[in-house]
Amino acid sequence: MKGTKDLTSQQKESNVKTFCSKNILAILGFSSIIAVIALLAVGLTQNKALPENIKYGIVLDAGSSHTSLYIYKWPAEKENDTGVVHQVEECRVKGPGISKYVQKVNEIGIYLTDCMERAREVIPRSQHQETPVYLGATAGMRLLRMESEELADRVLDVVERSLSNYPFDFQGARIITGQEEGAYGWITINYLLGKFSQKTRWFSIVPYETNNQETFGALDLGGASTQITFVPQNQTTESPDNALQFRLYGKDYNVYTHSFLCYGKDQALWQKLAKDIQVASNEILRDPCFHPGYKKVVNVSDLYKTPCTKRFEMTLPFQQFEIQGIGNYQQCHQSVLELFNTSYCPYSQCAFNGIFLPPLQGDFGAFSAFYFVMNFLNLTSEKVSQEKVTEMMKKFCSQPWEEIKTSYAGVKEKYLSEYCFSGTYILSLLLQGYHFTADSWEHIHFIGKIQGSDAGWTLGYMLNLTNMIPAEQPLSTPLSHSTYVFLMVLFSLVLVIVAIIGLLIFHKPSYFWKDMV
């Protein structure tokens, strides 16, 4: 009986072994097939051959003090994705802004030549004819147009004729509004920061919002105007003129924006000089916004050559006056504050000059001259508090002009002389103009470039005009790098585990099965 019993148990064991091995074999086979398919699918979708079709775009920023040409590049197949456009070149045109050519329009063609030729070199010849070129003029031309629509139109007409001579697809030159300048700057920085990309979990199709998706506000400072743009907490606005609605990548944004014409750093300085010379007792202006020992002669006719100084205009008993620097930050700050009329506000809250400003919300990117000036002063670090910035400005402005010239020998004196004023003006504008505080100062990030692209309105302008920002979220969201790595590792592990179990099953002695039964 014992032998029979042993035989029966051996048979049972053999049957179990056969049954288990068949099932396990099926499971392992199925698992490995799934893992291989998954690896191939993830690998192929993520690493499909890069599209050869690269597109280019050119935007000229015709600012009040100079013109810059930007060249952008992106893969054609991905033009509706977020963050795929990047800047490949910036060319600064030699000379002043185009509005200064009003009396010499015939020189505009030569003025633009170098940078347009540079674009010809950078962009492959085969792409020239399909590369759009846009020129946007900002506050310098807005001021010229205030003087005469014809004069502004004549300048743009010559610009258009000059740009049409190049082999690119010229799309026109126009004066953009202050609202557009603010809005496109906001779009640019949020596009580059990836704020419009609604990331999807690898196991879910539903986009989820994270705190990271809160957009940044945009602070732009030019020579003739300054813009503030952000999404306020309260969606209802007291001032419809300052409200913009966008639908970008499937999400609605209610944006506040305002452009302060005449409050760019150059025009603000002209305003301050025109204001201060009114009370000067003679043709010497002792100016706290310039370094001690600094001297410069200013023509009264130049002072009144801008619409921005009209409110301070008066007959002076001299044709010229001399600025004599005394380098006092506190006095300079006080003088600058007089440019902001804060006594009148027809809303619940204003910035200055009776312009509505909702409570500040979130982080802000401060770019263009905000960045250039603060970067020169070495004050762009996130760790530098507002109090520290003020201390540094006090120290900088009080430094003698001769010392400053020696310390910054490579910098043009015209620019070097104005950093004390510009830094003071930036602090005054942000703190008293826009109501940032010592606490909210840490929410201001001084930004020059984001992933190699300049922060500014030009990228946003091109994205809009080339219809590269869809209203709705594109259907297929590509995997993020981390999700891709996770999936590749996961399915590779599955394959490895399957292989190990397979080896164990088919290469282990019979006691392995005994233990299992």
């Epitope: 009003v102 147009r145 205030m146 003087e147 005469s148 004069l151 009209k310």
Partner: antibody, heavy 123, light 105 residues
């Protein structure tokens, strides 16, 4: 009410100089471009010189370039035309004229004209 | 210089419609303006930027055109409209047409 009153005209010998003045009232003078336009007896209108509101653009007709100088004193609401090396062909009625505006933008058309001042260049 | 050409004279009866033309030697966009001058008076602005009626000007006056060809229309003409009409361009430094003398029959 917008008013432009010219003065300083008269009879002058060829080669001599004369300075015309125009006193403006009834509007914010420094917000507007100003011009001198002349009309020879029995003839058409000829633009002479322009001075934009913020002096960004000062321009002259080829016939007077180098001889005439336009200027303005905003605090005194006054426009001037300094005429030198006068010729017989400069004989005309000289109008002080204000630039118009297209909404918020300046325009090179002429919306208000003074009565004119006569300049006669003769020996 | 941009030369503006006008027909020298026109004679119409009161109540009729009259069109005064002005042709520019080169395109001036819409920067064409019209003035009326009566004997012994300074010119008076009628139309600015091709088609905009100046303030205080009767709606009988209208302007049209762009580029090189422009028209001032008076409909209907009244006895008081006897005057010389000048066109002026401002695309380049200002120039005037020689004027069209409108007489009533």
């Amino acid at each position: 009410e917008v008013q432009l009153v010219e003065s300083g005209g008269g009879l002058v010998q060829p080669g001599r100089s004369l300075k015309l003045s125009c006193l403006a009232s009834g509007f914010t003078f420094n917000n507007y471009g100003m011009n001198w336009i002349r009309q020879a007896p029995g003839k058409g209108l000829e633009w002479v010189a322009s001075f934009s509101s913020s002096s960004t653009y000062i321009s002259y007709a080829d016939t007077v370039k180098g001889r005439f100088t336009i200027s303005r004193e905003n605090a005194k609401n006054t426009l001037y035309l300094q005429m030198t090396s006068l010729r017989s062909e400069d004989t005309a009625l000289y109008y002080c004229v204000r630039h118009g505006r297209y909404g918020g933008y300046g325009g090179f058309y002429f919306d208000y004209w003074g009565q004119g001042v006569m300049v006669t260049v003769s020996s | 210089d941009t030369v503006l050409t006008q027909s020298p004279a026109l004679a119409v009866s009161p109540g009729e419609r009259v069109s005064i033309s002005c042709r520019a030697s080169e395109g001036v966009k819409s920067y064409m303006h019209w003035y009326q001058q009566k004997p012994g008076q300074q010119p008076k602005l009628l139309i600015y930027k091709a088609s905009n009626l100046a303030s205080g000007v009767p709606a009988r006056f209208s302007g049209s055109g762009s580029g090189t060809d422009f028209t001032l229309t008076i409909d209907p003409v009244e006895a008081d409209d006897t005057a010389t009409y000048f066109c002026q361009q401002s695309w380049n430094d200002p120039t005037f047409g020689a004027g069209t003398k409108l007489e009533l029959k």
